[in-house]
Interface confidence: low
């Protein structure tokens, strides 16, 4: 992914579309890679990542990965293509407007991951149980 201050050179009128043909431009995501975090035992946390990046590819979405082991807690924020696995997991919730954390099985640590497709949506990561049920907000048709 290209940092925000680097201008990309793309021909005018080059357009990228999704499977439906809807116009798609790259979105903005928090992109700090792996940072130590104080986020623990909270319903939601802010990423505290000051870097907002334009994702390199139009199909990329925002991802956050929260990991806790005996030594520390880290939060990873990136752009990633939902067609490809991340940390060996499929991004099942890539169309969600919010980053709703779901626990994944990883030996030796507690591992949560979320993905979402609205600008900087991985800045606010949500652990609250109430969002993990069939929240109507998540049923909105989201397109880019």
């Amino acid at each position: 992914t290209i940092p925000p201050h680097v201008q990309k050179s793309v021909n005018n009128d080059m357009i990228v579309t999704d499977n439906n043909g809807a116009v798609k431009f790259p979105q903005l995501c928090k992109f700090c890679d792996v940072r130590f975090s104080t986020c623990d035992n909270q319903k939601s946390c802010m990423s505290n990542c000051s870097i907002t990046s334009i994702c390199e590819k139009p199909q990329e979405v925002c991802v956050a990965v929260w990991r806790k082991n005996d030594e520390n807690i880290t939060l990873e924020t990136v752009c990633h293509d939902p067609k490809l696995p991340y940390h060996d997991f499929i991004l099942e919730d890539a169309a969600s407007p919010k980053c709703i954390m779901k626990e994944k099985k990883k030996p030796g640590e507690t591992f949560f991951m979320c993905s979402c497709s609205s600008d900087e949506c991985n800045d606010n990561i949500i652990f609250s149980e109430e969002y993990n049920t069939s929240n109507p907000d998540l049923l909105l048709v989201i397109f880019q």
Epitope: P4, Q7, K8, S9, V10, N12, D13, M14, I15, V16, T17, N20, G21, A22, V23, K24, F25, P26, Q27, L28, I54, P97, S117, S118, D119, E120, L140, V141, I142, F143, Q144
Partner: antibody
């Protein structure tokens, strides 16, 4: 509150040029795709052009390709439409609008008040 | 390009009436359908996005339904400020296209 204010419209002869501007306030301009939509007198709405949040990608309707160019200056919170080789059929009110093709929901909202472009000899 | 056809092109109604406007796409557009209201000399205003989601600040008397090719905008009880022209717009494919408009006039 969110405001989009267009300027630069006026009377121009066929073959002439105009540059429209849209000054934006009330939201983080650099984070959103922007578009131009036009409306000929007494007619319906027609999408003209869109530009991505960073300004690196643009898309135009076929009838203006090679003649119109959309651009933006994120440091000035301003959207532009450079219109060259103007034709009588380009006569319309030109609206700038936030959205379309940005992340999130694919619609135009909000809109500016519009600026009238009249192409006539 | 996808053609959007609205009907009727105009209608007369009274305050308190239930008003229905339809929009038909020339091919399936899933739920990629938005509705706008425009008053004379003013900019369009988004009412409904994604076929049925009410935009923030829009009165609940406005509702949208449909998917595929056939869509409906309903005003459950017409108010004086609702007399305007209404447009549908598809965002399923490029270029995004609008219906020709439906003018709602006072009877």
């Amino acid at each position: 509150q969110v405001q989009l204010v267009e300027s630069g419209g006026g009377l121009v002869q066929p073959g002439g040029s105009l540059r429209l501007s849209c000054a934006v306030s009330g939201f983080k301009f650099r984070r959103y795709a922007m578009s131009w939509v036009r409306q000929a007198p007494g007619k319906g709405l027609e999408w003209v052009s869109s530009i991505s949040a960073s300004g690196d990608r643009t898309h135009n309707t076929d009838s203006v390709k090679g003649r119109f160019s959309i651009s933006r200056d994120n440091s000035k919170n301003t959207l532009y439409l450079q219109m060259n080789s103007l034709r009588a059929e380009d006569t319309a009110v030109y609206f700038c609008a936030k959205g379309l093709a940005a992340s999130g929901k694919n619609y135009f909202d909000p809109w500016g008040q519009g600026t009238l472009v009249t192409v006539s000899s | 390009d996808i053609q959007m056809t609205q009907s009727p092109s105009s209608l007369s109604a009274s305050v308190g009436d239930r008003v229905t406007i339809t929009c038909r796409a020339s091919q399936s557009i899933s739920s990629y359908l938005n509705w706008y209201q425009q008053k004379p000399g003013k900019a369009p205003k988004l009412l409904i996005y994604a076929a049925s989601s009410l935009q923030s600040g829009v009165p609940s008397r406005f509702s949208g339904s449909g998917s595929g090719t056939d869509f409906t905008l309903t005003i459950s009880s017409l108010q004086p400020e609702d007399f305007a022209t209404y447009y549908c717009q598809q965002s399923y494919s490029t270029p995004p296209t609008f219906g020709q408009g439906t003018k709602v006039e006072i009877k």
